[in-house]
Interface confidence: medium
Amino acid sequence: EPHSLRYNLTVLSWDGSVQSGFLAEVHLDGQPFLRYDRQKCRAKPQGQWAEDVLGNKTWDRETRDLTGNGKDLRMTLAHIKDQKEGLHSLQEIRVCEIHEDNSTRSSQHFYYDGELFLSQNLETEEWTVPQSSRAQTLAMNVRNFLKEDAMKTKTHYHAMHADCLQELRRYLESSVVLRRTVPPMVNVTRSEASEGNITVTCRASSFYPRNIILTWRQDGVSLSHDTQQWGDVLPDGNGTYQTWVATRICRGEEQRFTCYMEHSGNHSTHPVPS
């Protein structure tokens, strides 16, 4: 899994007038990391783990960056010509990643009223626009504005890519939290299914980093993919992750099945409770 930093900003307009505030959230390695507190005009860490990433900092740098990004997005929304009466939103999602081989990826996506209309690879500066005519119109509108704005030049996109990666590296380098290993807690439960069958569920929780193998085995052999159901690997809000895998088995054959877990070089097997 690559390390990633994901910015999610939203600005609103009402009856064609762009509102002064903005919404912003930042995810680090898929975990809610920062949000912009509109009432306090500050970037705020999301939970203790986020505070631990940078230690006792004032988050001024993050506040400044998010505020600048919010203002840019408000200006962009002001240049969308086809705004009708009522409430409208412009959302920008920007993601940068550092992979294990040290290669990087950066992209930017714009949504109007929740509909994707423009994407950009920030490394190649290649734009992608969905086929719908509404998306084409919106994209032309926004791209023309971005071209007109002296700040939104080739240099600017390179800087956006570089700044995101620089922040990500800063978090990774300064944080013991992001270099730690937290082994999962594994819990196996059973529940009644159809007559003669039971559903067994294996849950792994509170682990870090995100990479994990969790699978059911019968007589020591992994079951096929299509006989198991997997949950997504999701953040649990504490800087760690959780996931699950389930399968249906015949009652009476429980002892033949085990849940196999592999995480950060360690592995374990967990039987079905009787």
């Epitope: 009432q39 005009c41 500050r42 004032t58 506040t63 400044r64 505020t67 600048g68 203002k71």
Partner: antibody, heavy 118, light 107 residues
Amino acid sequence: QITLKESGPGILKPSQTLSLTCSFSGFSLSTSGMGVGWIRQPSGKGLEWLAHIWWDDDKYYNPSLKSQLTISKDTSRNQVFLRITSVDTADTATYYCARRTQGYFDYWGQGTTLTVSS
Amino acid sequence: DIVMTQSPATLSVTPGDRVSLSCRASQSISDYLHWYQQKSHESPRLLIKYASQSISGIPSRFSGSGSGSDFTLSINSVEPEDVGVYYCQNGHSFPWTFGGGTKLEIK
């Protein structure tokens, strides 16, 4: 009608502790987004923000004075307090409390004057 | 800390003049800039919020402009009651800082 009023000792000796009270009406510090801060102004000089407390008891301090400052509140009595330890003659000023909601100070008290003198 | 620099320190004007007061931030603060007026022996009063947004009850002759690090407070037609000191405030980065003020005098 929103009003804020500061009260304090008026005169202190160097090294003593200053205790200020801001009593307000017309709004509540239990309302989400509400905050009250302290700002001071030496005679004939500019404004300096000192400390701020929010509805959720989040507190902000000016880093240059943080070790001396403690801000607190009594929501039920509509009061905010500021303590400054080890005052010096440089702390002689008018102290204002002000309401801050959406990023700016929209209502101010009349101020209370402190003189630090030996 | 963000340093707010106001100029000029003092401004002497004639009633009816249009005047501009300048405020510069040591780094970009977007539009998180607020203006206050303080008359002699009074507490400060909010004039303009977020660089250019007007405040209810403030005469329309007061207006604000600017973004980033350069800001201006304009008074369309100065009246004698406008005498006082005008402060700008950084509402963006902690700690919140004020400019040194511009004193407006009537000739």
